[in-house]
């Protein structure tokens, strides 16, 4: 039988009524445009409603925007536009929220094509009140804030100026010219590419990076023939083009650009690309784009440093530039990734690596799934997950993977049973213990979100007809009641819950569509009194996350130590509430192998757990860069993974040696770089 | 170029019955709401139908509630309007209009088809 | 259903002068779902105003819309001859749709 449909599954009792008193509906007056919702704070119940409208194939004859408010998480709203004296607001801009619970809000506003410069109206109390102001340039990009004080502002003019603002932009400062790019960096400071010549994109790698550490007052030049930068936890990176020819290398500096050291990956041509997938405080996940027009690369590994790589995964799914990459970081569980290959063959398989990288492997078939007609043996195949590159290829998916930090170990996601990705309609699949193991959760596709960090799962199917039926479950997908939560089906546009998955509220957001009009409208229901006690110690059990094989001594042991923790049991139906906290209890293991990556110029064959030396590189003395000198490798073959936290047991021995030579390939040397103050 | 020809009126008897069509051109039919407007010889202009693009939400003027059906075809971008139980007071000229947008005004209009009820 | 009531029912005016016609709703009106029409004899009606104040693909800037609530305006700011003609307002806020009775301008 289909998931849910089972005779053993606990109704939850009364839920009809309960859910009934807790749903509201707000039908939003204006002729339906386009909407955008921005949850402002943290727990604070504060969510802003953008809605916009202009004809069709007119230029902005016609155009209307109006701002709603809700203080109760979606139950209520109330129009503020006059707060914003019932301006136009551009939505590419989007509305821009100030970090962490400063209550802060920027909108961008259309303006008329004389004016000397742009519009925004500022809050800074959650939206409670606005107050206008007129620019003296006209913006290019949102404005952005920085990590560290939500007073201080960046923008790009339409004119390419790098524009300041250290009073929450009550005044503006245009602190240099000619500028690309520009990003916030830590402790308040500021990177950006400016060009010398004609513009961005005729002196795409001929660009210079520069630093700002006190919002203008003085510069300092860290870099020439830029072709892009990134930032990615504490690494700063530069593509930087080759002096002989068109290629370009990765330079990566953890000292805000000071000093810089050769990434020891491939060149990349004109056509090619790099990417970072991931980045945090420990390692990077690089992709790097094959030669040719194959949507495919190669996935590499950092150490702590960020210089020296290894291979992690070939053939990995990268369509373009900008384009499609499955890659996705399963926040549920440590260490775990999923993305997708691109077979000889060309078809597209899912991969899952549990160990941040080191290893790679095809998902486990779910126990209640037939293999599908993709599949040459029907008992053997695998689960292959639907994400990015599947709904740009417009198939059936109207979601992503989904995880969720405080809902240890659930992942969800659209996908097929069989050998490769199936175009066919795909089901939904979760797993309970961070992508080891797979159930059908649900029949053809839905919308799905987490709510009271994975006490209840909240979904929505997906249907080119009207709805009016939510779908939930208090026991991580394995049984399903179904509420009709309004009378007249609505064109279902999107569920939103506060992100952090903590909140008990969903919002079902649509359309009514008559010969009329077609109007915005949204029902929000409060699941607070189907979960109606708090969670108590009994309803938790001890997990062991990564466990494999409980008679091992080292099972549950990823990247040196292992982790307990307390879980909600399924058959619990209680709230763990906004103040949930994941306890966990962590135990370091000994160094093994797999505690160790390959170093440089050395690689695992396939199901190996030994590093082996590249053929190309033996006998060969390894020598690399780093800070601009080149450094002599002593190695046999490993280096500890970065945030491996083992001891004892197995010691590779690693030695560098530094051979007090400047390396000529380092673009990015000391003496190429200068200062200058305002 | 974005066209409506109506076609189907005539004389007839009161109490007879008569179907209006609606031939559309030059835009995507099947995204939008259409209308049935009429207007009697010599005065204003009175709304008389509406249906939604998919035909699921329909409206109608009380003056001809229960004696006029709406419809449409997307797929032979028509739209119909089959009047029965004809009155005097339905004689008029018959157009078919296309809203601008989702709940906008009428920025397209047809040439009209007279109907004429008489004995 | 919302009543609009368009005043006067006949404006005699020359070529040149200053046209203003009022619509005044039964209740409440969003602009947004305010139009505008002119119909010539013979001829189906036409686009000239939507929201109460944006003008339609390729109305000439002598004509303008105003108003909110229960009270609309058109104006014609100089007569052209081709100007003469019966002006219709309409609401598309609320079923049923509703049409003014029309306001006939005429030359003098």
């Known amino acids: 039988s289909a998931p849910g449909e089972d005779e053993e599954c606990g109704r939850v009792r009364d839920f009809v009524a309960k859910l009934a008193n807790n749903t509201h509906q707000h039908v939003f007056d204006d002729l339906r445009g386009s909407v955008s919702l921005s949850w402002v704070g943290d727990s604070t119940g504060v969510i802003l409603v953008l809605t916009t409208f202009h004809v069709p194939l007119v230029i902005m004859t016609f155009g209307q925007s109006k701002l709603y408010r809700s203080e109760d998480y979606g139950k209520n709203f109330k129009d503020i536009t006059d707060l914003i004296n019932n301006t136009f607001i551009r939505t590419e801009f989007g509305m821009a929220i100030g970090p962490e619970n400063s209550g802060k809000v920027v909108l961008t506003a259309e303006v008329s094509g004389g004016s000397r410069g742009g519009r925004i109206f500022r809050s800074s109390d959650f939206a409670k009140n606005f107050v206008q102001t007129d620019l003296p340039f006209h913006p290019l990009t949102q404005m952005m804030y920085s990590p560290q004080n939500s007073d201080y502002l960046l923008a790009l003019s339409t004119e390419n100026g790098l524009w300041v603002s250290k009073n929450f932009g009550g005044k503006w400062e245009e602190i240099h010219k000619a500028v690309c790019l520009a990003k916030w960096g830590s402790d308040n400071t500021i990177f950006f590419t400016t060009y010398a010549n004609g513009s961005c994109k005729a002196d795409l790698g001929a660009l210079e990076l520069w630093r700002t550490s006190d919002l203008g007052k003085s510069f300092k030049t860290i870099g020439v023939k830029i072709y892009s930068f990134g930032l990615g936890g504490r690494f700063l990176f530069a593509s930087v083009m080759a002096d002989k020819d068109t290629t370009r290398r990765i330079h990566v500096s953890t000292d805000q650009g000071d000093t810089w050291s050769m990434a020891q990956l491939p060149s990349v041509g004109q056509e090619q690309f790099y990417s970072i997938l991931a980045a945090n405080d420990d390692m990077v996940f690089m992709h790097v784009d094959e030669p040719g027009d194959t949507g495919f690369g190669t996935i590499f590994t950092s150490d702590d440093r960020g210089i020296v790589y290894s291979k992690s995964l070939d053939r990995h799914l990268y369509t373009t530039t900008g384009g499609e990459t499955d890659f996705t970081n399963v926040t549920s569980l440590r260490g775990v990734y999923i993305t997708s290959v691109l077979s000889e063959d060309n078809s597209i398989q899912t991969m899952i690596t549990f160990d941040q990288g080191g290893r790679w492997t095809h998902l486990r078939k779910p126990e209640n799934s037939e293999c599908d007609a993709t599949a040459k043996n029907k008992n053997e195949c695998s689960l292959h997950i639907h994400a990015s590159y599947s709904i740009s290829q417009k198939l059936n998916v109207p979601m992503a993977p989904l995880s969720e930090p405080n809902a240890v170990g659930i992942v969800i996601a659209h996908g097929s049973v069989g050998d490769a990705i199936s175009v066919m309609v795909p089901d939904v699949y979760i797993s309970d213990d961070g992508g080891y193991s797979w159930t059908k959760m649900l029949e053809g596709p839905h919308y799905y979100t987490i709510l009271d960090s994975g006490g209840i799962i909240v979904a929505i199917e997906h249907s080119s007809r009207p709805i009016n039926v939510i779908k939930f479950s208090t026991d991580e997908g394995q049984c399903w009641q179904t509420y009709t939560f309004t009378r007249d089906p609505i064109y279902f546009t999107g569920l939103a819950s506060e992100p952090g998955a903590r909140s008990m509220n969903i919002s079902i957001w649509g359309f009514t569509e008559s010969f009329l009009t077609s109007q915005w409208v949204s029902y929000t229901i409060d699941f607070k009194d189907i979960l109606e006690r708090n969670c108590e110690e009994k309803d938790y059990t001890i997990w062991l996350a990564h466990s494999t094989d409980p008679e091992d001594y080292e099972d549950g042991c990823i990247l040196g130590y292992k982790e307990q923790f307390l879980r909600l049991r399924k058959s619990s139906v209680c709230q763990n509430g906004r103040d949930y906290v994941v306890t966990k209890q962590p135990s370091i293991c000994l160094c093994s192998l797999e505690d160790f990556l390959c170093d440089f110029g050395y690689y695992r064959p396939e199901n190996d757990s030994k590093c082996v030396e590249q053929p190309e590189l033996k006998g060969h003395d390894l020598e690399f860069c780093l800070y601009g000198r080149e450094e002599h490798l002593t190695t046999n073959g490993y280096r500890k993974i970065p945030g491996d936290k083992c001891q004892g047991g197995v010691n590779p021995v690693r030695e560098v040696k530094d051979l007090k030579k400047k390396c000529t390939s380092n673009f990015l040397s000391p003496e190429k770089q200068n200062s200058k103050s305002n | 170029e974005v066209q409506l020809v109506e076609s189907g009126g005539g004389l007839v008897q009161p109490g007879r019955s008569l179907r209006l069509s609606c031939a559309a051109s030059g835009f995507t039919f099947g995204d939008y709401a259409m209308h049935w407007v009429r207007q009697a010889p010599g005065k204003g202009l009175e709304w008389v139908s509406g249906?939604?693009?998919?035909?699921?939400?329909?409206g109608y003027a009380d003056s001809v509630k229960g004696r006029f059906t709406i419809s449409r075809d997307n797929a032979k971008n028509s739209l119909y309007l089959q009047m029965n139980s004809l009155r005097a007071e339905d004689t008029a000229l018959y157009y078919c209009?296309?809203?601008?947008?989702?709940?906008?005004?009428?920025?397209?209009w047809g040439q009209g088809t007279m109907v004429t009820v008489s004995s | 259903e919302i009543v609009l009531t368009q005043s006067p029912g006949t404006l005699s005016l020359s070529p040149g002068e200053r046209a203003t016609l009022s619509c005044r709703a039964s209740?409440?009106?969003?602009?947004?779902?305010l139009a505008w029409y002119q119909q010539k004899p013979g001829q189906a009606p036409r686009l000239l105003i939507y929201g109460a104040s944006s003008r339609a693909t390729g109305i000439p800037d002598r004509f303008s819309g105003s108003g909110s609530g229960t009270d609309f305006t058109l104006t014609i700011s100089r007569l052209e001859p081709e100007d003469f003609a019966v002006y219709y307002c309409q609401q598309v806020a609320v079923s049923p749709i509703t049409f003014g009775g029309g306001t006939k301008v005429e030359i003098k």
């Open positions: 249906i939604s693009w998919n035909s699921g939400s329909i």
């Open positions: 209009a296309k809203p601008l947008y989702r709940g906008g005004p009428f920025d397209i």
């Open positions: 209740q409440s009106v969003s602009s947004s779902y």
